[in-house]
């Protein structure tokens, strides 16, 4: 049995926070090929830990299985009384068999009644479900497919002839806005050019673009 406090089960201590190096050291640190960080746990230790984990898992599974068996036993003991045969003879055992058979018959009857009720309920549920489907069918909406459509086309489809005027207005608005945007872009572009010329980036930029 693995003890929870054993070394094997104990997690390795977290590594201390790395010491802050001065900026002058960083270049060398970055350029030097540093050795692969060696694992603190040896292969045999890893195997030992794996084995231990498997053991714990196995024990856990066994415990669960035992619990299930216990549960089954408890369930059965509440439903089935233990046979108390001490002092009872042939006559009593015969009678006990009769009693138990009668009990089985009664339980079977009850089971039959319950099954009949369940079947009736299932049938009722099926009928009601069918009714729901039938009612849905009367107001059946077509299944909508995702369609790529422009706002204008959608407006046209929705509003029909009335949409013509609003569409024209919308087009006009769009056009005005487009002109404003172009003007703005031009100004921004000029300003960028000036900056590039000043910083000597123009040549480099052309080279890069080519």
């Amino acid at each position: 049995m693995a003890d929870g406090s054993s070394d094997a089960a104990r997690e390795p201590r977290p590594a201390p926070a790395p010491i802050r190096r001065r900026s002058s050291n960083y270049r060398a640190y970055a350029t030097e090929p540093h050795a692969k960080k060696k694992s603190k746990i040896s292969a045999s230790r890893k195997l030992q830990l794996k084995t231990l984990l498997l053991q714990i898992a196995k024990q856990e599974l066994e415990r669960e299985a035992e619990e299930r068996r216990g549960e089954k036993g408890r369930a059965l003991s509440t439903r089935c009384q233990p046979l108390e045969l001490a002092g009872l003879g042939f006559a009593e055992l015969q009678d006990l068999c009769r009693q138990l058979h009668a009990r089985v018959d009664k339980v079977d009857e009850e089971r039959y009644d319950i099954e009949a009720k369940v079947t009736k309920n299932i049938t009722e549920i099926a009928d009601l479900t069918q009714k729901i489907f039938d009612l849905r069918g009367k107001f059946k909406r077509p299944t909508l497919r995702r369609v790529r459509i422009s706002a204008d086309a959608m407006m046209q489809a929705l509003l029909g002839a009335r949409a013509k005027e609003s569409l024209d207005l919308r087009a006009h608005l769009k056009q005005v806005k487009k002109e404003d945007t172009e003007k703005e872009n031009r100004e921004v572009g000029d300003w960028r050019k000036n900056i590039d010329a000043l910083s000597g980036m123009e040549g480099r930029k052309k080279k890069f673009e080519s």
């Epitope: 009384q81 001490a86 002092g87 009872l88 003879g89 042939f90 006559a91 009593e92 015969q94 006990l96």
Partner: antibody
Amino acid sequence: EVQMVESGGGLLKPGGSLKLSCAASGFTYSNYAMSWVRQTPEKRLEWVATISSGGSYSFYPDSVKGRFTISRDNAKNTLYLQMLSLRSEDTAMYYCARRDNYYGSSFMDYWGQGSSVTVSS
Amino acid sequence: DIQMTQTSSSLSASLGDRVTISCRASQDITNYLNWYQQKPDGTIKLLIYYTSRIHSGVSSRFSGSGSGTDYSLTISNLEQEDIATYFCQQGHTIPLTFDTGTKLELK
């Protein structure tokens, strides 16, 4: 020494009810089935009821079925017989007896001294 | 129900006699037969179980035999303390039934 002592008997009117008790000692009570047997004024012996060792099963003749109930308290080593709707033919000496069996043959191996029940109008 | 009958309701015998009490079942009870003794003070004791087995503490003067439907209890060398009523009981089928008893008296 195996001993059974009955109590609770008395005189009562038809339709009345009564509960007899039997205190057992000298043996491991919970290991044995127990019975009640009565003896009529004509000295006939009649088996009345039997209960299994743990109290789960009970057995009765048709003459008392539904009217009499045998029960037991293993913690108190006591056997009971609850008698309802009593009739004049239930008048008898009621004996408590320990049950045992041998190869399926069951028998009453130890008996109490009896408790008298008289049903009369 | 199985009926149990004894050939005689009373029997007279002398001390030292060998006495046999018979019991008959209305059907085969396959040796599931017991014998009880009731003393005049009302105390009841088991004598014989399973046709021929002697209960502990019972004198070996008592013996039982029989099979099928016919059974008997024999008391050899009758003594004063044996004066009592003897009952047979079948343990084959519920309801358990007794015979009417045989009262043993001294001549």
